[in-house]
Interface confidence: low
């Protein structure tokens, strides 16, 4: 399971699902924190190791996932053509 942790924000505020957040995940053995359907999730550690990011199903329902060159991240493409790029540091 994962919970969203807000960075630099008053803890009394509702947890905002915004860019300036990280996820704290309690994952089973062989899993690691990742992204599924644009939400933090526990994913197979092999996906992270091999950088096959799209295998996490990181994009929203109905979007297309593509690996960035050199597997530095992925893009999610909406049916309308707009693209959101995520890079992994």
């Amino acid at each position: 399971t994962c919970e969203i942790v807000t960075l630099d924000r008053d803890s009394s505020q509702p947890r905002r699902t915004i860019a300036r957040q990280t996820a704290r995940c309690a994952c089973r053995k062989g899993q690691i924190a990742g992204t599924t359907r644009a939400r933090p999730a526990c994913v197979d550690a092999r996906i992270i190791k091999t950088k096959q990011w799209c295998d996490m199903l990181p994009c929203l329902e109905g979007e297309g996932c593509d690996l960035l060159i050199n597997r530095s991240g992925w893009t999610c493409t909406q049916p309308g053509g707009r693209i959101k790029t995520t890079t992994v540091s």
Epitope: T17, A38, L60, E61, G62, G80
Partner: antibody, heavy 121, light 112 residues
Framework: QEQLVESGGRLVTPGTPLTLSCTAS????????MSWVRQAPGKGLEWIGI?????STDYASWAKGRFTISKTSTTVDLKITTPTTEDTATYFC?????????????????WGPGTLVTVSL | ELVMTQTPPSLSASVGETVRIRCLAS??????ISWYQQKPGKPPTLLIY???NLESGVPPRFSGSGSGSDYTLTIGGVQAEDAATYYC??????????????FGAGTNVEIK
């Protein structure tokens, strides 16, 4: 050309449920997030709610219980559960672009022309 | 609940002037703002999304700026056809209660 058209607007008496429909041409509704927005005569725009490809929904706090958004394979529908005179407005359906949630901006890139609902005794 | 305070409610400008419309969000919305133009009897049309991105087909005299909770739509060198009502739309998503979108009250722009 990508277009939306709303239908179902008419004169109803208070308390009579009314369902509006939104159909698309040039793209498939099923792959998109869709929203309903309304505008009372001479007033501003009010966001009612959103429906996701999965069929799950979110509503403005004032709209919860007053409206139900649903979808079929070809339409996105808005049910006004118990109309009052305050619900007299033009109702627009709009396609959601951007990304809903998790730090993504959300906006409407295609709007229908609207359908007028009049609630009167 | 997110509140978008839009100012001014109305303004009058001459052709060629620069017009600025401001929207102040009740909290940081991290560039989750878009701007729309609406003419009488017509649906709104998208001008700017993500605070500063110009929608395709929109004249470059329209621009958006801002960050945090404070955003501005600028029309540089306003034209007669820009007479309309302009709305901002702010959006946030809460992990507990989902997506919430709120429009500003609108700004009616009259061209002298």
């Amino acid at each position: 050309q990508e277009q939306l058209v709303e239908s179902g607007g008419r004169l109803v008496t208070p308390g009579t449920p009314l369902t509006l429909s939104c159909t698309a041409s040039g793209f498939f509704l099923s792959g998109y997030y869709m929203s309903w927005v309304r505008q009372a005569p001479g007033k501003g725009l009010e966001w009612i709610g959103i429906i996701y490809p999965s069929g799950s929904t979110d509503y403005a706090s004032w709209a919860k219980g007053r409206f139900t958004i649903s979808k079929t394979s070809t339409t996105v529908d808005l049910k006004i559960t118990t109309p009052t005179t305050e619900d007299t407005a033009t109702y627009f359906c709009a396609r959601v672009a951007g990304y809903v949630g998790y730090g993504y901006e959300t906006f409407f890139d295609i709007w229908g022309p609207g359908t007028l609902v009049t609630v009167s005794l | 609940e997110l509140v978008m305070t839009q100012t001014p409610p109305s303004l009058s400008a001459s052709v060629g002037e620069t017009v600025r419309i401001r929207c102040l969000a009740s909290e940081d919305i991290y560039s989750g703002i878009s701007w729309y133009q609406q003419k009488p009897g017509k649906p709104p049309t998208l001008l700017i999304y993500g605070a500063s991105n110009l929608e395709s087909g929109v004249p470059p005299r329209f621009s958006g700026s801002g960050s945090g909770s404070d955003y501005t739509l600028t029309i540089g060198g306003v034209q007669a056809e820009d007479a309309a009502t302009y709305y901002c739309l702010g959006g946030v998503t809460y992990s507990s209660t989902g997506t919430h979108l709120t429009f500003g009250a609108g700004t009616n722009v009259e061209i002298k």
